[in-house]
């Protein structure tokens, strides 16, 4: 496993695929996390609660994901190797208020031939 | 005047400075617009209304700006010329509800010597 950053560990690599981790504060109860590659939304995961506190998880783009109480990890099997691409996470916080959206960590992922290596630039 | 894009006209140049235009829907009545350069918030403008409909404009970072009913333009006199930087606008919508934040147009601004020229890549 090679990590893009020992501090943030946004990118990690497994069997030719990449895991991209999007962290969020543990206080956040209801959220939407989106993973962008440049302007394209690759993955979107929404967690909400109803009035009876039942939890709904929506994954409309059918991404492989893992949700914990402070991060969403998306698993991409075929990262774009044609060029270095800029990936970043966008977090919409529904609960607790106030409603807000934060651009989270982002980084450039450079893939050379079949080797997965990562040049990471954290920005938010 | 040189425009980064004839369609969006996010960047335009005047006397060595750059005007960055952040568009928003005309239906938005109360908002916060932030201009980012990479991870750094350069400018922030908040327009709110009180219960008597009095308008409050907050400009805590003392940016030069122009506010219209569908855009906020920020004027930067000394854009960072050390390297190409990625600029984007972030819009928080307070009114009308639901509260939300949108990442608006973004682009790379490349400055070579004293010449201002722009390579723009729209992403949202």
């Amino acid at each position: 496993e090679i990590n893009g950053s020992a501090d943030h560990r946004m990118f990690s690599f497994h069997n030719g695929g990449v895991q991209i981790s999007c962290k969020y504060p543990e206080t956040v109860q209801q959220l939407k996390m989106r993973l962008f590659r440049e302007r394209e939304v690759l993955c979107e995961l929404t967690k909400t609660k109803g009035s009876g506190n039942a939890v709904s998880i929506k994954n409309p783009m059918l991404c492989l994901y893992h949700l914990s109480n402070n991060s969403v990890s998306f698993f991409l099997n075929n990262p774009d190797s044609s060029q270095g691409s800029y990936y970043f996470c966008s977090l919409s916080i529904f609960d607790p208020p106030p409603f807000q959206e934060r651009n989270l960590s982002g980084g450039y992922l450079h893939i050379y031939e079949s080797q997965l290596c990562c040049q990471l630039k954290l920005w938010l | 005047e040189i425009n980064g894009s004839a369609d969006h006209r996010m960047f335009s140049f005047h006397n060595g400075g750059v005007q960055i235009s952040c568009k928003y829907p005309e239906t938005v009545q109360q908002l916060k617009m932030r201009l980012f350069r990479e991870r750094e918030v350069l400018c922030e403008l908040t327009k709110t209304k009180g219960s008597g409909n009095a308008v409050s404009i907050k400009n805590p970072m003392l940016c030069l700006y122009h506010l219209s009913n569908n855009s906020v333009s920020f004027f930067l006199n000394n854009p960072d010329s050390s390297q190409g930087s990625y600029y984007f606008c972030s819009l928080s919508i307070f009114d009308p509800p639901p509260f939300q934040e949108r990442n608006l147009s973004g682009g790379y601004l490349h400055i070579y010597e004293s010449q201002l020229c722009c390579q723009l890549k729209l992403w949202l």
């Epitope: 206080t27 109860q29 209801q30 929404t46 909400t48 609660k49 109803g50 009035s51 009876g52 506190n53 039942a54 709904s56 929506k58 529904f94 609960d95 607790p96 208020p97 | 009308p96 509800p97 639901p98």
Partner: antibody, heavy 117, light 111 residues
Framework: EVQLVESGGGLVKPGGSLKLSCAAS????????MDWVRQAPGKGLEWVGN????????EYSPFVKGRFTISRDNVKNILYLQMNSVKSEDTATYYC??????????WGQGTLVTVSS | DIVMTQSPSSLAVSPGDRVTINCKSS??????????LTWYQQKTGQAPKLLIF???TRHTGVPDRFMGSGSGTDFTLTINSFQTEDLGDYYC?????????FGPGTKLELR
């Protein structure tokens, strides 16, 4: 502006059925859980049930579970309440409400259902 | 199910009065750092309206004379300087678990 408009109320006999509708506008309907809350004449508020954003999760009050069904049409922006095997104690004004993540932040004007023979 | 109780059930008030309505839950409504307790106002012949959520946060547009407070199982809605347009019924409500339940309500009437 958020608007919720209920319809379909009226007189129904005990054991009968009725379907209420709630037309939503002014917001992205498919982004929100929606609920039904009722109020018997001269009484307080009582939660009936809810449905999540795409209709895959529903919850019901124990008083209506097995008799009432909540559904939604996210293309038409309509919330439904199918009431079967109604009882006299189901007589109430039925309100359609938007669950704004942590409260009922928008309510319809209500539609009156009267169960009587 | 969590049982919500309110006191008083009715209250005669005059303009300018400081009004206090109490709500008690049968178990704590604290989840994380928030209390899942909401207050609604209902005027005669109208649908309820959201006043306060998370026990103490005023909803958009609610006058600042309305204040919510409390923790654990005991909560209070205070109206500082009651106005005649505040007449109506007030309900507390929890969304800690299913089923969410309302208190029986408190009716404010003119003295």
């Amino acid at each position: 502006e958020v608007q919720l408009v209920e319809s379909g109320g009226g007189l129904v006999k005990p054991g009968g059925s009725l379907k209420l509708s709630c037309a939503a506008s002014g917001f992205t309907f498919s982004d929100y859980w929606m609920d039904w809350v009722r109020q018997a004449p001269g009484k307080g508020l009582e939660w009936v049930g809810n449905i999540d954003e795409d209709g895959s999760i529903t919850e019901y009050s124990p008083f209506v579970k097995g008799r009432f069904t909540i559904s939604r049409d996210n293309v038409k922006n309509i919330l439904y309440l199918q009431m079967n095997s109604v009882k006299s104690e189901d007589t109430a004004t039925y309100y359609c409400t938007r669950w704004g993540r942590f409260a009922f932040d928008s309510w319809g004007q209500g539609t009156l259902v009267t169960v009587s023979s | 199910d969590i049982v919500m109780t309110q006191s008083p059930s009715s209250l005669a008030v005059s303009p300018g009065d400081r009004v206090t309505i109490n709500c008690k839950s049968s178990q704590s409504l604290l989840s994380g750092s928030f209390h899942y307790l909401t207050w609604y106002q209902q005027k005669t012949g109208q649908a309820p309206k959201l006043l306060i959520f998370y026990a103490s946060t005023r909803h958009t547009g609610v006058p600042d004379r309305f204040m919510g407070s409390g923790s654990g199982t005991d909560f209070t809605l205070t109206i500082n300087s009651f106005q005649t347009e505040d007449l109506g019924d007030y309900y507390c409500h929890h969304h800690y678990n299913a089923p969410p339940t309302f208190g029986p309500g408190t009716k404010l009437e003119l003295r």
